[in-house]
């Protein structure tokens, strides 16, 4: 449902996707329950979302994932949600951070990120893991979204 | 504060309810500092929201849970933001996951879920958990709750 | 983006500051990518979110901790959001616990929190935690915020 | 397109099992999740079961938990529905469907039907 042709709803929600890349940006895809308002704002390489408008937006993700500490480094397992703006630096918008489970052979943990954030037309925000591989991608365990304001 | 006769905010933040049910969906009460905005949005049966009209919805929930490994099933303590639609597959929209305490009796653990969705008129969402016993009532602890865009 | 003079956007994202205090309210500062509207919501004191304007928001927390099962008390690491509106008690909104890492020094958790209340006008918004002296101030790691409907 | 052909209703008595069964054939590929609804006589029709092709995730309505289980076996394409504890009120022709890959939450998209198979529950 539009607000009017000037002010348009704009949503989108998507679903994590396993990727045989070795990056740590997390890929996803328009498939399963997803939500892409109209094509003010749109999933780009599988991996970001950007939008026309200038404006206000919620902005957020959740990420499930099995690990165990044997078996990864010490570091904690942490997911960034990160902003691309045109001429801009890269920033972290929010992070988060868990620390490996002793469960054997891995122990499952879900962390959400949220937050309201200024976005500039063409701005691209992104999520970021430590671990991708040990991302869970059953259904509704990963997702990634926004809303303007 | 109304948006118009034609758009009027629609709303909801209800409060988790013990229940002696034996059922996995958790049971809510519009109770302590609750919202319910308007009856375009309704608790039904204590389980489930209820929304009137289609539309982008952002839909949370929130899940406090004491959980000990020695006590518990192997498996992770889950939860899942379930969504129901006149004519459709009951759908899984999102599930959070967290591995159970070593500690003891019990360790206490929360997760957040939320997104943004497409309702239709007469959709209802509600909240499902591997064990109700384990979960805390306490003041906060576990709420559920919408608002349309 | 202003939605109109009589109904301006209303938001708000704030960065959290290490403190000496030993106060268990959080501390909080407009640094960093933080987000402040306008005048109709303010940060006052560094600790707690007000606003001018009666209407339902959207208010959240994320609080990032690091603790040792050993190092700390028996009871788990606890986030309140908590409401102060004039003439009235103070009410925890919404809580989130979390049981001490057993990992060494200590293991990082992170917590969301999130909810849609009705505050009033002159209402303020505050993050209680049991141990501050435990909160990751790293950047992204723990915000505070609200958006009006 | 996915075509899909029921099998296993018929006559059963009160506490008695029956297991369907639901195969697809045609673009299986672009089966997102299978499942089960029922439709009694003068009645609307109502959702049963379902599973996600993704993990094997599974949803039940309330009337059938703990009595029924969905299934699949992906090398056969096959969803299976094992019914236990049949009841009366259980009686209805049992459609199978398949929602397609990519249909989002904005759109209220088509899923392919079986013909329906009738189970009756009668002493």
């Known amino acids: 449902m539009q607000k009017g042709d000037q002010n348009p709803q704009i949503a989108a929600h998507v679903i994590s996707e396993a990727s045989s890349k070795t990056t740590s940006v997390l890929q996803w895809a328009e498939k399963g329950y997803y939500t892409m308002s109209n094509n003010l704002v749109t999933l780009e390489n599988g991996k970001q979302l950007t939008v026309k408008r200038q404006g206000l937006y919620y902005i957020y993700a959740q990420v499930t994932f099995c690990s165990n500490r044997e078996a990864s480094s010490q570091a904690p397992f942490i997911a960034s949600l990160c902003l691309k703006s045109p001429g801009r630096f890269e920033r972290i918008l929010l992070r988060a951070a868990n620390t490996h489970s002793s469960a054997k052979p891995c122990g499952q943990q879900s962390i959400h990120l949220g937050g309201v954030f200024e976005l500039q037309p063409g701005a691209s925000v992104f999520v970021n893991v430590t671990d991708p591989s040990q991302v869970s991608h059953g259904t509704g365990f990963t997702s990634f979204g926004l809303l303007k304001l | 504060m109304q948006k118009g006769d034609q758009n009027p905010q629609i709303a909801a933040h209800v409060i988790s309810e013990a229940s002696s049910k034996t059922t996995s969906v958790l049971q809510w009460a519009e109770k302590g500092y609750y919202t319910m905005s308007n009856n375009l949005v309704t608790l039904e049966n204590g389980k489930q929201l209820t929304v009137k009209r289609q539309g982008l919805y952002y839909i949370y929930a929130q899940v406090t849970f004491c959980s000990n490994r020695e006590a518990s099933s192997q498996a992770p303590f889950i939860a899942s933001l379930c969504l129901k639609s006149p004519g459709r597959f009951e759908r899984i929209l999102l599930r959070a996951a967290n591995t159970h305490s070593s500690a003891k009796p019990c360790g206490q653990q929360s997760i957040h879920l939320g997104g943004v969705f497409e309702l239709q008129p007469g959709a209802s969402v509600f909240v499902n958990v591997t064990d109700p016993s384990q979960v805390s009532h306490g003041t906060g602890f576990t709420s559920f709750g919408l608002l349309k865009l | 983006m202003q939605k109109g003079d009589q109904n301006p956007q209303i938001a708000a994202h704030v960065i959290s500051e290490a403190s000496s205090k030993t106060t268990s309210v959080l501390q909080w500062a407009e640094k960093g990518y933080y987000t402040m509207s306008n005048n109709l919501v303010t940060l006052e004191n560094g600790k707690q979110l007000t606003v001018k304007r009666q209407g339902l928001y959207y208010i959240y927390a994320q609080v990032t901790f690091c603790s040792n099962r050993e190092a700390s008390s028996q009871a788990p690491f606890i986030a309140s959001l908590c409401l102060k509106s004039p003439g009235r008690f103070e009410r925890i909104l919404l809580r989130a616990a979390n049981t001490h890492s057993s990992a060494k020094p200590c293991g990082q958790q992170s917590i969301h929190l999130g909810g849609v209340f009705e505050l009033q006008p002159g209402a303020s918004v505050f993050v209680n935690v049991t141990d501050p002296s435990q909160v990751s101030h790293g950047t992204g790691f723990t915000s505070f915020g609200l958006l009006k409907l | 397109e996915v075509q899909l052909v029921e099998s296993g209703g018929g006559l059963v008595q009160p506490g008695g099992s029956l297991r369907l069964s639901c195969a697809a054939s045609g673009r299986t590929s672009n089966i997102y999740a299978m499942g089960w609804f029922r439709q009694a006589p003068g009645k609307e029709r109502e959702f049963v079961a379902v599973i996600y092709s993704s993990d094997g995730s599974t949803l039940y309505a309330d009337s059938v938990k703990g009595r029924f289980t969905i299934s699949a076996d992906n090398s056969k394409n096959t969803a299976y529905l094992q019914m236990n504890s049949l009841k009366p009120e259980d009686t209805a022709v049992y459609y199978c469907?398949?929602?397609?890959?990519?249909?989002?939450?904005?759109?209220?998209?088509?899923?392919?039907w079986g013909q329906g198979t009738l189970v009756t529950v009668s002493s």
């Open positions: 469907a398949a929602e397609p890959y990519g249909s989002g939450s904005s759109l209220m998209s088509e899923y392919d």
